[in-house]
């Protein structure tokens, strides 16, 4: 569902609406059970009270059961996005049932008369899980909702009506706009299946945020923070700015949440892994890649179920396109000054050496300040895996590769002449693998010589008490 | 067996305008979206639009919001293309074509109509 | 809008040739890219949708492949009746756009 308002204009400019030909009495709600991965392939309409289609087309009582519920939209036509859901189902769970919840009618409106009709669809939904039911074998908790912003909150609105407990809801990027800070009976919460999982990707403090910004399930996932997604740049999506609009962004950010979970379907063996921090800032300062008490998990179509979290919020960084996995790693870098570093922060990058791959220089983000005299935390992470770490290398950008900062050694050189130099001291850097759970502790390979100045290099290796590790083996292992 | 039929030639005068009509046959007609494909004298083909008979919901390349309009008859199973304040620019071949379940590809196409502007 | 290019205006073989059409698109499309062949005052026929899925009563010559930006139509060992205007389109955002076309023919 792309941007509700956006730069090119009103909504309703946007909008060609059917004329009013009411001829016959037609649902506006349709279900459409994806028979063949062939698009072509019209599939099989499901209505209530109608048991032949079930039986001509093959509908699997005891298989998982997929409803994909899409949201608003901009055109009468269904967006690309459903057709790799779809497929990714059928190619993950070959013998599950995958049914398209139509509702185009009803979402191809004003964006507020399409947030009203949600209701309306849940509705619908639920009354089709009801008279499912009703057959035998067919169990409740083989249903997984999946519903893509509006239709996530659909998705939450079926599963309050029906009668019981729907298995899964997944929500991608649910809709922000009516329902941010909305009772939980207006949106999707976690009380709407026995497990709801979010994946938020457009959220914005400032500004129209498309997607929802607080937490609606049993577990939310930030990917990237939850705002700014790479590969949705603007030279990223427009490749020259000349060939689309910033309403081309919106839609990258926000369907990266489908594709995150398309992601997790057909790349099993690369899994993603969140984890569970307070904020966002928190997570960039690498402070949260703990697995303990269940604060790890798989995101996508792969998480566990964790009923007993509500609203708890997991972050990961990504790749700009699949598959997304990265590798994350934590460094407690602890720095020690003896004279005043001046006002400027240093501007530091890490090489990661491993027995599989190296990394490429990678900064090392500082979120806050650096605080000198006390170990400081960094996240930092690769798109390849470097299997075990055997050496790092340490660099402090030189004064000739930024005039800012150029300017600040002149400023500081100003204003304390008899000290112009800044060195720091650094003999060992502690480093924790989101993904492996593994600690290790590097040196610098001569104590004497662990300082640091602009333009300079420092060199760690494992100390020499060798590996210093917890969790011998990956806590994923359960879980991919 | 699937069948997309257009109506014949035209030949018009700037200004006028024309509807092309796309009689569906051998599916079912409000299961698919109908698009709508210009083909310029010798040139590449371009998408003006498409159109969801179920409902008559439609969507317009931006080039073309102006200048087509898309409809349908459920009970004709036939789909219309109307072109207004007709200039040269709009002398081609148009082509109606059948998308698949989503929309994206097109697997069935009409023979195409002529349209000739001239003065 | 995106835009695919066709890089080759024409492309002369001999048949009984292999031949590989290629087409590039301004930012990742995935794999929602069709080939179309039509020949002369005929109709666009289908030959490949999906970037790889082949379509009944297309002969087995004719393949697809790529993903995201770079993507090829292959054809082999061509035939006389496969000369002709070959074109790609994308259906992964509005508005869907084909390519300028590439014209396959007899050396």
């Known amino acids: 569902s792309p941007v509700p308002f956006g730069p090119e204009g009103r909504l309703e400019d946007k909008l060609h609406k059917p004329k009013a030909t009411q001829t016959e009495v037609k649902p506006s709600v349709r279900f459409n059970l994806r028979t063949s991965k062939d698009p072509e392939h019209e599939g099989c309409y499901l209505s209530v009270g109608h048991s032949q289609p079930l039986e001509d087309c093959s509908f699997n009582m005891t298989a998982k059961t997929f409803f994909i519920i899409h949201g608003w939209t901009m055109s009468g036509i269904f967006e690309n996005w459903l057709h790799k859901l779809v497929s990714a189902l059928h190619t993950r769970e070959k013998d599950a049932n995958v049914v398209v919840v139509d509702w185009l009618p009803l979402a191809h409106q004003l964006y507020t008369d399409a947030v009203n009709n949600t209701r309306v669809v849940g509705h619908s939904i639920a009354r089709m899980l009801d008279w499912l039911q009703e057959k035998d074998d067919f169990s409740l908790g083989n249903v997984h909702l999946i519903g893509y912003s509006l239709g996530a909150h659909v998705a939450g609105y079926a599963g309050n009506f029906v009668k019981g407990t729907v298995g899964r809801i997944t929500g991608l990027d649910p809709a922000g706009p009516m329902f941010e800070g909305a009772d939980i009976h207006k949106r999707l919460s976690p009380d709407d299946a026995d497990f709801v999982d979010v994946l938020h990707t457009y959220t914005r403090s400032f500004g129209l945020s498309i997607g929802i910004q607080m937490p609606v399930g049993h577990i939310d996932i930030y990917p990237n923070g939850g705002d700014f997604q790479p590969g949705c740049g603007l030279n990223d999506v427009l490749g020259s700015i000349a060939y689309g609009t910033i309403t081309e962004v919106v839609k990258c950010e926000h369907e990266r949440a489908v594709h995150l979970f398309v992601d997790s379907l057909v790349n099993q063996d690369k899994p993603s892994f969140a984890f569970q921090c307070t904020d966002s800032n928190r997570f960039k300062k690498g402070i949260c890649l703990s697995c303990r008490k269940n604060r790890c998990n798989n995101i996508g179509y792969n998480a566990k179920k964790m009923r007993k979290k509500r609203n708890s919020k997991m972050y990961l960084k990504t790749r700009a396109g699949m598959p997304f996995k990265v590798y994350h790693y934590q460094l407690k870098v602890h720095m020690f000054s003896y004279n005043n570093s001046g006002d400027t922060q240093p501007t530091l990058y890490i090489t990661l050496y491993g027995s599989n791959a190296d990394s490429q220089n990678l900064p090392l983000e500082i979120v806050e300040k650096i605080e000198l005299n006390a170990t400081n935390t960094f996240l930092v992470y690769t798109e390849e895996d470097l299997g075990d770490l055997l050496k790092m290398r340490l660099t402090w950008e030189g004064v000739a590769h930024s005039w800012y900062n150029l300017w600040n050694e002149f400023r500081n050189y100003l204003s304390q002449p008899s000290n112009p130099s800044r060195e720091l001291y650094i003999r060992r850097i502690r480093v924790k693998s989101g993904e492996t759970q593994r600690k290790v502790t590097f040196c610098t390979q001569d104590p004497t010589k662990s300082s640091i100045s602009p333009g300079q290099e420092l060199w760690f290796h494992k100390c020499q008490d060798g590996w210093k590790m917890k969790n011998k083996t990956s806590p994923f292992v359960n879980l991919a | 067996e699937v069948q997309l039929q257009q109506s014949g030639p035209e030949l018009l005068k700037p200004g006028a305008s024309v509807k092309i009509s796309c009689k569906a046959s051998?599916?079912?007609?409000?299961?698919?979206?109908m698009h709508w494909v210009k083909q310029s004298h010798g040139k590449s083909l371009e998408w003006i639009g498409g159109?969801?008979?179920?409902?008559?919901?439609?969507t317009y390349n931006e080039k073309f919001k102006d200048k087509a309009t898309l409809t349908v008859d459920k009970s004709s199973s036939t789909a219309y293309m109307e072109l207004r304040s007709l200039t040269s620019e709009d002398s081609a071949v148009y082509y109606c074509?059948?998308?698949?379940?989503?929309?994206?590809?097109?697997?069935?196409w009409g023979q195409g109509t002529t349209l000739t502007v001239s003065s | 809008d995106i835009v695919l290019t066709q890089s080759l205006a024409t492309l002369s073989v001999t048949p009984g040739d292999s031949v590989s059409l290629s087409c590039r698109a301004s930012?990742?499309?995935?794999?929602?890219l069709h080939w179309y062949q039509q020949k002369s005052h005929e109709s666009p026929r289908l030959l490949i949708k999906?970037?790889?899925q082949s379509i009944s009563g297309i002969p087995s010559r004719f393949s697809g492949s790529g993903s995201g930006t770079d993507f090829t139509l292959s054809i082999n060992s061509v035939e006389t009746e496969d000369f002709g205007m070959y074109f790609c389109?994308?259906?992964?955002?509005?508005?869907?756009?084909f390519g300028g076309g590439t014209k396959l023919e007899i050396k």
């Open positions: 074509a059948k998308g698949d379940y989503y929309g994206g590809s097109y697997n069935y």
């Open positions: 051998g599916y079912t007609f409000t299961d698919y979206t």
């Open positions: 159109i969801n008979p179920y409902y008559g919901g439609t």
């Open positions: 930012q990742d499309i995935s794999n929602s």
């Open positions: 999906y970037a790889s």
């Open positions: 389109q994308q259906s992964n955002s509005w508005p869907y756009t």
